[in-house]
Interface confidence: low
């Protein structure tokens, strides 16, 4: 299953499959997730080690048992790959690292006014993988405001150095934010020239393209089909690059197929997994396990559940079957691709779905009325769980926010439905940033069921929580995916990085905003909050947030939206925007429904008809 916990001051011993430099543990974990053999990782922050060569070291590890012995190492951070973690699987990494220079091949230098602009340039350059920016206070005047675009053979820095007044980060192409655009066409009987960066075996050009998309240096590819004239080159997928970023030439060639990486696609990237099953095909590789199962789909499920399994072959040979079950060969290789592909067999083959982000785990698991005042514009994909609840009567307007917590579930405030409990007047927009982008053609979700907390009363502020079941499940993308729920009764975690988002008013007597706003707000103790609201009862099922001096808050139109906090690299839904005295007033914090206190209710209501929970929360 999916394991998300991090181990502080711990280092996994042995099992190394790769090492690299990464700026933090989260990026190291992402590299582990996308590495075909990595199950565990250990990261050494600069503060944890004196050996300059090992600072920022990210060590990717494999283990036959799925675990390795942990040794104590002050400052080290270890954890698990996020394979099998559904919507948490993403190659997108937005963080900017201050005081850090990520080294690589500097291929472009320009003067820019901010680190954000530098990151945008990197994202809009086909070859840029990461960047460094020298701020206006950099010690050498001639380098100030320099934006260095970089790449490296492995897509990660060749070294990372602590350096004052330098800021570094990664391209946001994996966040589907590139302005370059992509070419989705597949070119039959056409071979591209230029430099081969890798060679793998794939059953078709589409798997080849997905591998190219997630390979750090692949910009385009050529695939040789299974009827290619040279037998040893059949099913070869050549991952390619060039100085210019595009093929310098193409040659008409029977039984070849070429195309481009889809990493520069805007707003949508292919999933990093291959779900198709190939009948009459055998995939060769190292044997992991052999099991008898009923049907090729069960074989694929078995492979997906066994975390080390990369691909499988389901044999229909009479000697491999007994009764209704046949042998399911679970296999793996060094690069995650078959070492041999044979056609015309009595088998069916396919890949593990461990990297698909539409897995069953609708919400992450761990084992062990009111708009933003004083906020700033959000960017695409920054808050992918945020939804807009709109009402269509004669005209259509935004009324409330909400949070996507599963394929078919949205969590919001009960008071959003005061006077409007009709399912069919509501339209739920997900994966949007600008309300003005909504047209009559913009897809929206309709409500199947509104579940208002049984103890909620319009006249009181208590139990201000409601669940919406959507008529149809939503697919997850970089711009539309759920937020993790907290643990039941989560009281021990100290959240220091909390944000409220919404399209609500920017001042008490304002109007709905076009661009989704965000504001960083500190949590306030319930005792402190009660002092500020002596006419109301602040219960343990509420959480408060705000600045003593005011100026930043949620406001009308933000109701039902999320209060999220980042802890150990993971965002959690801590509160639901509920009420407050005015907006952003001095010593009048915003009051939010405390989600952790309602975990039993949420899990009970989201149980499917067969009794299986639609979502799980950290236990």
């Amino acid at each position: 299953g999916c394991l998300t916990q991090l181990y502080e001051n711990a280092f996994f011993r042995g099992g190394d499959v790769a090492s690299m430099y990464t700026p933090n543990a989260q990026y190291c974990q992402m590299r582990c997730t996308f590495h075909p053999r990595c199950l565990l990782f250990s990261f050494l922050p600069a503060s944890s080690i004196n050996d300059m060569e090992k600072r920022f070291g990210c060590f990717l590890k494999d283990s036959v048992t799925g675990t390795l012995p942990k040794v104590h190492r002050t400052g080290a951070v270890s954890g698990h790959s996020l394979k099998q973690c559904g919507h948490q699987i993403s190659a997108c990494h937005r963080d900017i690292y201050k005081g850090v220079d990520m080294r690589g091949v500097n291929f472009n230098v320009s003067k820019v006014s901010s680190v954000e602009e530098c990151q945008k340039r990197c994202t809009s350059n086909i070859r840029c993988q990461f960047f460094s920016y020298a701020t206006q206070t950099f010690h050498k005047a001639e380098y100030r405001n320099n934006c260095l675009l970089k790449y490296s053979p492995g897509g990660t820095p060749t070294a990372i150095k602590v350096l004052s007044n330098v800021e570094s980060g990664f391209s946001l192409k994996p966040c589907a934010l590139s302005e370059i655009g992509c070419h989705m066409n597949i070119f039959q009987h056409l071979a591209f020239s230029d430099v081969d960066v890798a060679r793998v075996l794939t059953p078709d050009a589409f798997v080849c393209r997905t591998i190219c998309t997630y390979h750090p240096n692949c910009l385009f590819f050529t695939f040789y089909t299974n009827v290619w004239k040279i037998e040893s080159q059949r099913n070869v997928c050549l991952l390619k690059t060039s100085e210019s970023g595009t093929p310098s030439s193409s040659t008409p060639q029977e039984n070849t197929i070429s195309g481009y990486s889809l990493l520069t696609c805007k707003r949508t990237l292919p999933e990093p997994c291959h779900s198709k099953i190939y009948p009459g095909v055998d995939f060769g590789g190292e044997e992991l396990n052999v099991t008898f199962v009923k049907g090729v789909n069960v074989c694929q499920e078995t492979c997906t559940k066994m975390i080390r399994c990369q691909f499988f072959t389901y044999s229909l040979l009479p000697e491999d079957c007994k009764e209704e079950k046949c042998k399911c060969f679970l296999r793996l290789s060094m690069d995650g691709s078959p070492t041999r592909i044979a056609y015309g067999t009595q088998g069916s083959s396919g890949y593990s779905l461990r990297l698909c982000n539409t897995g069953d785990n609708s919400v992450c698991t761990t084992k062990t009325s009111t708009r933003i005042v004083g906020g700033t514009n959000s960017s695409w994909g920054e808050w992918p769980w945020q939804v807009s609840l709109q009402v269509k009567l004669t005209a259509q307007r935004h009324l409330c926010g909400g949070s996507l917590i599963g394929h078919q579930w949205v969590l919001t405030a009960a008071h959003c439905f005061d006077g409007l409990p009709l399912q069919d007047v509501w339209r739920i927009y997900s994966g949007i940033l600008n309300l003005s982008d909504i047209t009559k053609d913009t897809p929206f979700s309709q409500i199947k069921e509104i579940i208002i907390h049984q103890n909620y009363k319009v006249s009181e502020g208590n139990h201000d929580i409601a669940l919406i079941k959507l008529q149809a499940p939503l697919n997850y993308t970089e711009f539309q995916k759920p937020i993790c729920l907290p643990s039941k009764g989560d009281t021990s975690t100290i959240y220091t990085n909390c944000w409220v988002t919404g399209w609500g008013f920017s001042k008490e007597k304002g109007e709905i905003q076009n661009i989704l706003q965000k504001v960083n707000i500190p949590l306030v103790t319930n005792e402190e909050c009660q002092k500020r609201y002596q006419d109301y009862k602040i219960t343990q099922r509420m959480v408060c947030a705000g600045y003593k001096e005011g100026g930043k808050d949620a406001c009308k139109g933000d109701s039902g939206g999320p209060l999220v906090c980042k802890h150990n690299g993971m965002w959690r839904l801590v509160g639901i925007t509920s009420w407050g005295e005015g907006c952003a007033r001095r010593e009048q914090p915003g009051v939010y429904t405390k989600v952790a206190e309602y975990m039993d209710w949420i899990l009970e209501k989201t149980q499917s008809s067969d009794g299986k929970a639609q979502m799980q929360s950290p236990a």
Partner: antibody, heavy 118, light 107 residues
Framework: EVQLLESGGGLVQPGGSLRLSCAAS????????MGWVRQAPGKGLEWVSW???????TYADSVKGRFTISRDNSKNTLYLQMNSLRAEDTAVYYC????????????WGQGTMVTVSS | DIQMTQSPSSLSASVGDTVTITCRTS??????LNWYQQRPGEAPKVLIY???TLESGVPSRFSGSGSGTDFTLTIGSLQPEDFATYYC?????????FGQGTKVEIT
């Protein structure tokens, strides 16, 4: 306003040459695949050539080796150099942008007439 | 190359009629099919892309359907400005190809 404006058409003798230009405005030209589509008098549309945002070019078999497509992103201009012209190249030549999802020609110029005749 | 066959090549209809134009491809193209309208003396304009998605500003009387190899453009309640030639185009495989066109004339 998004716009494409062709120029350079005219009357030319068989075997002669012409260079068509297409000036783009209202969008970030360098991001888009651009192409030429032609229409012979009273006939349907025929794709001629296009150039991807990265510079890779492709041509219809009927013009391969005779026509060259190019672009100057700094000038927001697309070109079609037509050599060894034949009578069957007589047509209205449209400049078009490949922009919609799944590669529709979403923006078209008004067209420029090329007549090849002795 | 993928061959595109449009039918009929021309048709006569009256204002208010519903008109259906079909486009058949020589191999499966999933939903990579676009429809264009060309009025006399004008450049073509895209009506529908990806089989059934209406280009913004195109009236809702135009609709597209189909998948694989058989596709349809339907014009419900024909208006005077709809008398034009309609082309289908595939963008599934290089080279992209157009149908030969269907001319919709006034009865």
């Amino acid at each position: 306003e998004v716009q494409l404006l062709e120029s350079g058409g005219g009357l030319v003798q068989p075997g002669g040459s012409l260079r068509l230009s297409c000036a783009a405005s209202g969008f970030t030209f360098s991001w888009y695949t651009m192409g030429w589509v032609r229409q012979a008098p009273g006939k349907g549309l025929e794709w001629v050539s296009w150039i991807y945002f990265g510079g890779l070019t492709t041509y219809a078999d009927s013009v391969k080796g005779r026509f060259t497509i190019s672009r100057d992103n700094s000038k927001n201009t697309l070109y079609l150099q037509m050599n060894s012209l034949r009578a069957e190249d007589t047509a209205v030549y449209y400049c078009a942008r490949l922009g919609g999802p799944l590669d529709a020609f979403d923006i078209w110029g008004q067209g420029t007439m090329v007549t090849v005749s002795s | 190359d993928i061959q595109m066959t449009q039918s009929p090549s021309s048709l006569s209809a009256s204002v208010g009629d519903t008109v259906t134009i079909t486009c058949r491809t020589s191999q499966t193209i999933n939903n990579y099919l676009n429809w264009y309208q060309q009025r006399p003396g004008e450049a073509p304009k895209v009506l529908i892309y990806a089989t059934h998605t209406l280009e913004s500003g195109v009236p809702s009387r135009f609709s597209g359907s189909g998948s694989g190899t058989d596709f349809t453009l339907t014009i419900g309640s024909l208006q005077p400005e709809d008398f034009a030639t309609y082309y289908c185009q595939q963008s599934f495989a290089f080279p992209y190809t157009f149908g030969q066109g269907t001319k919709v004339e006034i009865t």
